[in-house]
């Protein structure tokens, strides 16, 4: 067993910059927006730009703001209660299984193949066995024939946290 | 008067289990964010665990995640680490202390031992 | 290689002015408060400076904090025997979601 190593008074634990303001959790929770306070009692606000939280929360601290990387650009800009939204640049996509970087997308299909999907920010060029319709997914072979694909239109975001 | 008091340390084999205990009284625990620190004999610090003042939200040192588990009791003002699967590395003496990233009252630190 | 470096240690004069540094990323010191712990020797640390220059009361004004961009310093004046201790400065880390103590810095009064 071990007993007491204390300090009295002490001032309020991470007191707030002048520019954040403070509230009062609600059931133990801040609101969007916002994080809790060491001690419980208080709610802090987010820096705009620097840092965001999205749903009630009693967080130490509100969630770092996504920084865009090269090769991609910001949908929108992060808020206090949103972060940052960042997609591919026109001609690259983010996959599921490699989200950490945009890749080049294809320029045509292989031999055989028919295109019926474009590049999207968020997927690669779709090809189809002229045949059997199956898709081809994977790496493209040496390519003897292509088909040539335009940019696919921005759509929706590749890079969404929050 | 605040003050925490640490009980559940000991000597313990590698692959084994412990729960340290840290009863507080003196301030509303309820509302405060309560943290783990530990200290390897003749080494500095090492920050292991925090837990909110609900429970609601936790965080954990990458060096026992998915090991130990921090919880609470805050119907008896007492702050847990549950710690699995121990290692040689985890021997340490373990401090509790008030707050989530600034530590202002500790406890006076239970020692666990790893060993085989 | 420590997240925080700070000298391993540190030494002065009884009276003197000593300062000990601590060094880190945009990822913690350079982003969040930093806080500084005196250890004395088979004790608990203890906090002495919070939010990079606020002294907990009891704490002597002998102590004070500075935070420059990723660099933080601790200076203590008037430097007395009892103020022989292992310092720490800690800072949370956005980067590892977490705390980090710098690995202390011995300070040996003379």
């Known amino acids: 067993e071990s007993a007491l190593i204390t300090q009295q008074d002490l001032a309020p634990q991470q007191r707030a910059a002048p520019q954040q303001k403070r509230s009062s959790p609600s059931e133990g929770l801040c609101p969007p927006g916002h994080h809790i306070s060491e001690d419980g009692r208080d709610c802090i606000s987010c820096k705009y730009g620097q840092d965001y939280s999205t749903h009630w929360n009693d967080l130490l601290f509100c969630l770092r703001c996504t920084r865009c990387d090269s090769g991609e650009v910001e949908l929108s800009p992060c808020t206090t209660t949103r972060n940052t939204v960042c997609q591919c640049e026109e001609g690259t996509f983010r996959e599921e299984d490699s989200p950490e970087m945009c890749r080049k997308c294809r320029t045509g299909c292989p031999r055989g193949m028919v295109k019926v999907g474009d590049c999207t920010p968020w997927s690669d060029i779709e090809c189809v066995h002229k045949e059997s319709g199956t898709k081809h997914s994977g790496e493209v072979p040496a390519v003897e024939e292509t088909v040539t694909s335009s940019p696919g239109t921005p759509a929706s975001p590749c890079s969404l946290s929050g | 008067q605040m003050q925490l008091v640490q009980s559940g340390g000991g000597l313990v084999k590698p692959g084994g289990s412990l729960r340290l205990s840290c009863a507080a009284s003196?301030?509303?625990?309820?509302?405060?964010?309560m943290s783990w620190i530990r200290q390897a004999p003749g080494k500095g610090l090492e920050w292991v665990s925090a837990?909110?003042?609900?429970?609601?939200?936790?965080y954990y040192a990458d060096s026992v995640k998915g090991r130990f588990t921090i919880s609470r009791d805050n119907s008896k003002n007492t702050l847990y680490l549950q710690m699995n699967s121990l290692r040689a590395e985890d021997t340490a003496v373990y401090y509790c202390?008030?707050?989530?990233?600034?530590?202002?009252?500790w406890g006076r630190g239970t020692m666990v031992t790893v060993s085989s | 290689q420590p997240v925080l470096t700070q000298p391993p240690s540190a030494s002065g004069t009884p009276g003197q002015r000593v300062t000990i540094s601590c060094s880190g990323s945009?990822?913690?010191?350079?982003?969040?408060?930093v806080n500084w712990y005196q250890q004395l020797p088979g004790t608990a640390p203890k906090l002495l400076i919070q939010?990079?220059?606020q002294r907990p009361s009891g704490v002597p004004d002998r102590f004070s904090g500075s935070k420059s961009g990723t660099s933080a310093s601790l200076a203590i004046s008037g430097l007395q025997s009892e103020d022989e201790a292992d310092y720490y400065c800690?800072?949370?880390?956005?980067?590892?979601?977490?705390?980090?103590f710098g690995p202390g810095t011995k300070l040996t009064v003379l």
């Open positions: 202390a008030r707050g989530g990233s600034t530590f202002d009252i």
């Open positions: 003196g301030f509303t625990f309820s509302d405060y964010y």
């Open positions: 837990i909110s003042g609900s429970g609601g939200s936790t």
């Open positions: 945009n990822s913690n010191i350079g982003s969040r408060p």
């Open positions: 939010g990079n220059n």
């Open positions: 800690a800072a949370w880390d956005d980067s590892l979601t977490g705390y980090v």
